[in-house]
Interface confidence: medium
């Protein structure tokens, strides 16, 4: 599939609009601090160069790899050393080491200002004045804050973003039309970014085999009527797509994703009965729809798994012949029968099966040794079932905010060394599992909850990796991808932790809290809660609840006062003193 000019090939395949958008995303994900105008200039230069290669593939430099072309362009940025420090050293390297170096410097938590949403009229004016710049700015701002965002999917978000402004800037009540759409895009975007971050972590930290196993399980649940060979083909192609995107090869990734969507739609009869509507949509919507499509119905009368994977006398011979294919088939057969299991549970079962075969196929009587392997699955299945049952009961009893607070306390006690903003962010997201998943019937709860928790815990892992402070977090994050959640669940209070010194400033609040949104006010209170636990890790639930109730009453009282600032100063001192007494600080 060799082309004289790779850049010309991708430009022709993707078209100018998508080519420019993807190059902008790629550059913004690499150089996250660069101003918008600088990136636009670089993108325009690359685009003009690509056009010369389309006109003549033999033209000078057109035969260079995309990494070489893009890397050379990034390395022309004048302020590279001042802005990025040691990342500038990447430019002294040759490909492929230079690209690897850029990848290693991607920052999951870049020091960028929070995106503040302007007034609706201001946004609509900007949209009408220069639609192209407005949309590019959206791509740039998302890409630099989410350096692993799935690039072809970001094009889909940008298309929806444009549609929202096109529709709502003409509406009678612009704000009522636009704001809910922007909120939805923001929330979906954060979720999409976190899901993709887990895919990239899976590939980069645990390797292609781990990603392929995840994909076999998920696609087998989604397409239970497809046969194993079909699932294998999809897994191979999907792995290529995500490897490319996670590796910064965004043009190849988008191109291959389009090819995969085309293949799936051309072969939907042998894949799934649920794809018809997706396949009638335009490309970006089609790919998104396929990625989110509901599970197909399970074929009727699937035979027992035991016959082929336990009772057969050929189990060890088949396993020895092609271990990964045999395990892949086991995973496929198990997953297509269990849409009610989380992917990570299915992977734990497959790992247990593999470990058993490794041990038993070397034993004197292999069959006798592995005959009871399915019995070992029972506790593995019951553990997440029980955990979800308990936590959904707690969520229904407390509601989302207080459920988040319970998790904040739980996780701060487990890993108190982790920074307060990270604990707040991760615990808030963990707490969202309640409203996201507990409403589902039993059969859908586990795949919803445990696979969502894997995504959230990966956020903790990637943030912690940047500045490691806890051996326990490192251990849970690195030992096993599929056992991360059970590892964190099993952590008890960290008895080695030395409580943080009390600092009154941490608990000093001002009148500005009154003008915050409900969400931001919650974050302030939850930040204080984490700090309390760090000061007093042995505080009981009751003690913490009493202090938090007092705190809520204090904020409410002072926000109603005529002289808010004086109220916060005077009542705040009293609250701190009372809290110290209540907690024995």
């Amino acid at each position: 599939d060799a082309h004289k000019s790779e850049v010309a090939h991708r430009f022709k395949d993707l078209g100018e609009e998508n080519f420019k958008a993807l190059v902008l995303i790629a550059f913004a994900q690499y150089l996250q601090q660069c101003p918008f105008e600088d990136h636009v200039k670089l993108v325009n230069e690359v685009t003009e160069f690509a056009k010369t290669c389309v006109a003549d593939e033999s033209a000078e430099n057109c035969d260079k790899s995309l990494h070489t072309l893009f890397g050379d362009k990034l390395c022309t940025v004048a302020t590279l050393r001042e802005t990025y420090g040691e990342m500038a050293d990447c430019c002294a390297k040759q490909e492929p080491e230079r690209n690897e170096c850029f990848l290693q410097h991607k920052d999951d938590n870049p020091n960028l200002p929070r995106l503040v949403r302007p007034e609706v009229d201001v946004m609509c004016t900007a949209f009408h004045d220069n639609e192209e710049t407005f949309l590019k700015k959206y791509l740039y701002e998302i890409a630099r804050r989410h350096p692993y965002f799935y690039a072809p999917e970001l094009l889909f978000f940008a298309k929806r973003y444009k549609a929202a402004f096109t529709e709502c800037c003409q509406a009678a009540d612009k704000a009522a039309c636009l704001l809910p759409k922007l909120d939805e895009l923001r929330d979906e975007g954060k979720a999409s970014s976190a899901k993709q971050r887990l895919k990239c972590a899976s590939l980069q930290k645990f390797g292609e085999r781990a990603f392929k196993a995840w994909a076999v399980a998920r696609l087998s649940q989604r397409f239970p009527k497809a046969e194993f060979a079909e699932v294998s083909k999809l897994v191979t192609d999907l792995t290529k797509v995500h490897t490319e995107c996670c590796h910064g090869d965004l043009l190849e990734c988008a191109d291959d994703r389009a090819d995969l969507a085309k293949y799936i739609c051309e072969n939907q009869d042998s894949i799934s009965s649920k794809l018809k509507e997706c396949c009638e949509k335009p490309l970006l919507e089609k790919s998104h729809c396929i990625a989110e499509v509901e599970n197909d119905e399970m074929p009727a009368d699937l035979p027992s798994l035991a016959a082929d994977f336990v009772e057969s006398k050929d189990v060890c011979k088949n396993y020895a012949e092609a271990k990964d294919v045999f395990l892949g088939m086991f995973l496929y057969e198990y997953a297509r029968r269990h849409p009610d299991y989380s992917v990570v549970l299915l992977l734990r079962l497959a790992k247990t099966y593999e470990t058993t075969l490794e041990k038993c196929c070397a034993a004197a009587d292999p069959h006798e040794c592995y005959a009871k392997v399915f019995d070992e699955f029972k506790p593995l299945v019951e553990e997440p079932q029980n955990l979800i049952k308990q936590n959904c009961e707690l969520f229904e009893q407390l509601g989302e905010y207080k459920f988040q607070n319970a998790l904040l306390v739980r996780y701060t006690k487990k890993v108190p060394q982790v920074s307060t903003p990270t604990l707040v962010e991760v615990s808030r997201n963990l707490g969202k599992v309640g409203s996201k998943c507990c409403k589902h019937p039993e059969a859908k709860r586990m795949p919803c909850a445990e696979d969502y928790l894997s995504v959230v815990l990966n956020q903790l892992c990637v943030l912690h990796e940047k500045t490691p402070v806890s051996d326990r977090v490192t251990k849970c994050c690195t030992e096993s991808l599929v056992n991360r959640r059970p590892c964190f669940s099993a952590l008890e209070v960290d008895e080695t932790y030395v409580p943080k010194e009390f600092n009154a400033e941490t608990f000093t609040f001002h009148a500005d809290i009154c003008t915050l949104s409900e969400k931001e006010r919650q974050i302030k209170k939850q930040t204080a809660l984490v700090e309390l636990v760090k000061h007093k890790p042995k505080a009981t639930k009751e003690q913490l609840k009493a202090v938090m109730d007092d705190f809520a009453a204090f904020v409410e009282k002072c926000c109603k006062a005529d002289d808010k600032e004086t109220c916060f100063a005077e009542e705040g001192k009293k609250l701190v003193a009372a809290s110290q007494a209540a907690l024995g600080l």
Partner: nanobody
Framework: EVQLVESGGGLVQAGGSLRLSCTAS????????MGWFRQAPGKEREFVAA?????????DYADSVKGRFTISRDNAKNTVYLQMNGLKPEDTAVYVC?????????????????WGQGTQVTVSS
């Protein structure tokens, strides 16, 4: 789709031998049970031989060919073979290769998803 292409058929004298080959287009060939069926003019399609997935340790034959025909597979080449010795005029038929991922091995035609075009075997007396 899995494409199956048979080869090796031809005209042979009674008592002679032929080796049929069937090559599959799929990477996951190893996960398929493979079978040979045959259809003589004016007759129903009948089962000849089958071999299990993966190592191909389990084989099965129609009573009429037992001891004369041998089925084998080479996973590296995505190919299944049917070695036919002691051929008889009643073995004359179109021999068709089939692939199934429904079961580890099967002698039932309804459990096979994919079929080749077939190769003609003629045994003269």
């Amino acid at each position: 789709e899995v494409q199956l292409v048979e080869s090796g058929g031809g005209l042979v004298q009674a008592g002679g031998s032929l080796r049929l080959s069937c090559t599959a287009s799929r990477r996951a060939f190893i996960g398929y049970a493979m079978g040979w069926f045959r259809q003589a003019p004016g007759k129903e399609r009948e089962f000849v031989a089958a071999i299990s997935w993966f190592a191909g340790d389990t084989t099965d034959y129609a009573d009429s060919v037992k001891g004369r025909f041998t089925i084998s597979r080479d996973n590296a080449k995505n190919t299944v073979y049917l070695q036919m010795n002691g051929l008889k005029p009643e073995d004359t038929a179109v021999y068709v290769c089939a692939a199934s991922s429904a079961r580890p091995m099967s002698g039932r035609s309804d459990e096979y998803h994919y079929w080749g075009q077939g190769t003609q075997v003629t045994v003269s007396s």
